[in-house]
Amino acid sequence: LIIGFGISGRHSITVTTVASAGNIGEDGILSCTFEPDIKLSDIVIQWLKEGVLGLVHEFKEGKDELSEQDEMFRGRTAVFADQVIVGNASLRLKNVQLTDAGTYKCYIITSKGKGNANLEYKTGAFSMPEVNVDYNASSETLRCEAPRWFPQPTVVWASQVDQGANFSEVSNTSFELNSENVTMKVVSVLYNVTINNTYSCMIENDIAKATGDIKVTESEIKRRSHLQLLNSKAS
């Protein structure tokens, strides 16, 4: 969380941002809040990106003002116009690109004063893994697959019964480049699995951490997966 203070004459307003991550090809949110003003027409929101000379986005007098928007963001940005009055200056970024990563500044002007705060925005690809029993294999084998990751993640297997065990010798992980030549499909195979045990396939890069669990018993198979974005710090 980053909290910024700005000075305009003797007046400053508090602006708060939260570091976040965007999934390539999907829509992302750059979070920013500020002390609200009672009049929408008095609020100006400017989003800037380090190293970019044009504006990322500008909102003033109750509407978007995009005459000074940089080409790389054309047609890809929007604020939540109905939420500006309550202090939400967050930016929706459509079709996140790898090059959208960087430091952004959320700059706010209201009748109370001005303020700004920076945020770090990471971009990459991350997806939920799915763990299945590989019935085609000669021995009891688990297969963990996740369709889109970037940068290349690490894959670690763990088990509930053999906590702390190192499965690197009995697992094999491969990365297959997807058709857009950036993201990769992750496939990891774990051999010699035992029944009545819960196994976890953990995929992690510097943006996200995802886990796929599978519990195999004689009577049923239970699966669960979750994904967590890393380094979401407020500013």
Epitope: V44, Q46, L48, K49, E50, G51, V52, L53, G54, E68, D70, E71, M72, T99, T103, K105, I109, K114
Partner: antibody, heavy 121, light 107 residues
């Protein structure tokens, strides 16, 4: 010491070409946007062109658009201005300048000494 | 493009005088405004950025004020080395326009 040093100016005929260079030292070149600004004899300052830190975005004044090209070589810490189809009104001292501020919202805090371009037949 | 209009275009003043130069933008530039000093045969020097912030190494007798469309550069007590031409410049629009300049001469 932070420094910018221009070179490449000279006398050129109308319609001719010239390439200006600006060697940067004393700062991390690829984190700063850079500008070219010119000043005709006895006149005020006129912004010519700008380039982002990465070199990915370029901007030009209407008076030079389509004729001038700004570029940078990060490995050589050098900024360039390729000037084609030169006209008499391009005669000026050309300065390179560094943009202050990470987001391009501030002024130009470091300037070179300038290089003179004269377009005349 | 945003037009920047400076006034006066020239002024005569004495050492110790308080000098005020104004700059008006044709549309709002918020506080994205800088002031420069230029002496004959020399490159411009940044004095003020973000409308009110003093650049590194600039004496405190220089100050900037304003936001939106109207800006002022003030020299509280003119010194002999301050006789020069002063320019305003906006950074809001990616056309980075300069004002026409104000020449400060010795009375």
């Amino acid at each position: 010491e932070v420094q910018l040093l221009e070179s490449g100016g000279g006398l050129v005929q109308p319609g001719g070409s010239l390439r200006l260079s600006c060697a940067a030292s004393g700062f991390t070149f690829n984190t700063h946007a850079m500008h070219w600004v010119r000043q005709a004899p006895g006149k005020g300052l006129e912004w010519v062109s700008a380039i982002s830190g990465s070199g990915g975005s370029t901007y030009y004044a209407d008076s030079v658009k389509g004729r001038f090209t700004i570029s940078r070589d990060i490995s050589k810490n050098t900024l360039y201005l390729q000037m084609n189809s030169l006209r008499a009104e391009d005669t000026a001292v050309y300065y390179c300048a560094r943009l202050l501020g990470r987001f391009g919202e501030y002024g130009m805090d470091v300037w070179g000494q300038g290089t003179t371009v004269t377009v005349s037949s | 493009d945003i037009q920047m209009t400076q006034s006066p275009s020239s002024l005569s003043a004495s050492v110790g005088d308080r000098v005020t130069i104004t700059c008006r933008a044709s549309q709002t530039v918020y506080t994205w405004l800088a002031w420069y000093q230029q002496k004959p045969g020399k490159a411009p020097k940044l004095l003020i950025y973000d409308a009110t912030n003093l650049a590194t190494g600039v004496p405190s007798r220089f100050s900037g004020s304003g936001s939106g469309t109207d800006f002022t550069l003030t020299i509280s007590s003119l010194q002999p080395e301050d006789f020069a031409t002063y320019y305003c410049q906006q950074s809001y629009s990616t056309s980075w326009t300069f004002g026409g300049g104000t020449k400060v001469e010795i009375k």
